[in-house]
Structures are given as C-alpha cells and as structure tokens.
C-alpha cells in the first residue's frame, strides 16, 4: 500500500514523530511532539488561514 502523506515526517517540521506505528515502534509521542498526521493537518489549516486553499478564517 502507498504511504499516506501524513504518515511520514517532513524534515522542516521539527519536533515530529511518524504517525505510522511501524515507523515509531517505541511509541515515543509526547505532548511536545505531535504525530505526523496531526502536523500534516495543522500545516494544511495554517495554509488555509493564509489563503492558500479555501481562504476561510
């Protein structure tokens, strides 16, 4: 199966751990470190706030 884009951290995201549990076998996600799925979501939300996508806000 193809890897979902939000399953893998991007280098520029900083404190990030992969959403895919196979990529994070130790389960080290903490309050300070967001999963890649959440960061992908939040980055999209921020882009929309800046008017890149649907421009609501």
């Amino acid at each position: 199966l193809p890897t979902l884009p939000w399953s893998v951290c991007q280098e520029e995201w900083g404190d990030c751990l992969p959403s895919d549990p196979d990529l994070d076998p130790v389960g080290t996600i903490t309050n300070e470190t967001k999963s890649s799925a959440e960061l992908y979501f939040l980055k999209t939300v921020l882009q929309q706030k800046d008017g890149i996508e649907d421009g609501l806000g």
Epitope: L39, L42, K43, V45, L46, Q48, K49, D54, L56, G57
Partner: nanobody, 119 residues
Framework: QVQLQESGGGLVQAGGSLTLSCAFS????????MAWFRQAPGKERKFVAG????????YYDDSVQGRFTISRDNAKNTVYLHMNSLKPEDTAVYYC????????????WGQGTQVTVSS
C-alpha cells in the same frame, strides 16, 4: 466564548460502531478546523482525525485510517466521528478541539466523552 460539547460515547462490543458528535457554539463554526483526539487510561492525549474548515480535506492517524470517518455539518455547527470495526484498544475518552489556524495548538477543547469497547 466558544463551547464544544461531545456526545455519543458509550459501551460497545468489539467490531461494533459508534458515532460521536461535537456541537460547536459561540463563534463562527466555519472559521475553525476541527479535530478529534483520544486519551486512553494512563496515556497521553493523541490526535485521531481532523477536518478542514470547509470540510473537503480530512486527516487520520494510521491507527484509525479506514475504520473512522470525520465529517462536519456546517449548517448544524457540528463535527462527527463515525467509528466502525471498533477494537478494545479504541477505549478512551474522546475529545473534540477547534483550531483557527495555529500550528502550535488548539483554541478550544471539549470536555470529552467516554468510549469503552469490550471484547
């Protein structure tokens, strides 16, 4: 002041389904992206799913991908989490959260609703 009120939790057998609702009030719903989180006993709160402001884009944690569906009804100011093929490890308190476009966190949180999946 924004208020988020979750409902729909309960006890369900493994393999069953539940739909959680989160009613939003106090401000303009479409100004906020919405997300569901869960916190299992003794564990940290974890992102489950998110939906963007207008609703077409959805994001899921790998642990629920293909089993859970997040949706929103902007006419009813409500976000939903449809949960299918539930597993005992889905047992947790489920929270909804509203985000106005801040990567570092969420503007508002609900009080949570308990979901218990028995084997």
């Amino acid at each position: 002041q924004v208020q988020l009120q979750e409902s729909g939790g309960g006890l369900v057998q493994a393999g069953g389904s539940l739909t959680l609702s989160c009613a939003f009030s106090g401000r303009t719903f479409t100004h906020y992206a919405m997300a569901w989180f869960r916190q299992a006993p003794g564990k940290e709160r974890k992102f489950v799913a998110g939906v963007t402001r207008s609703g077409p884009n959805t994001y899921y944690d790998d642990s629920v991908q293909g089993r859970f569906t997040i949706s929103r009804d902007n006419a009813k100011n409500t976000v939903y989490l449809h949960m299918n093929s539930l597993k005992p490890e889905d047992t947790a308190v489920y929270y909804c959260a509203a985000n106005s476009g801040v990567v570092s966190g969420y503007d508002y949180w609900g009080q949570g609703t308990q979901v218990t999946v028995s084997s």
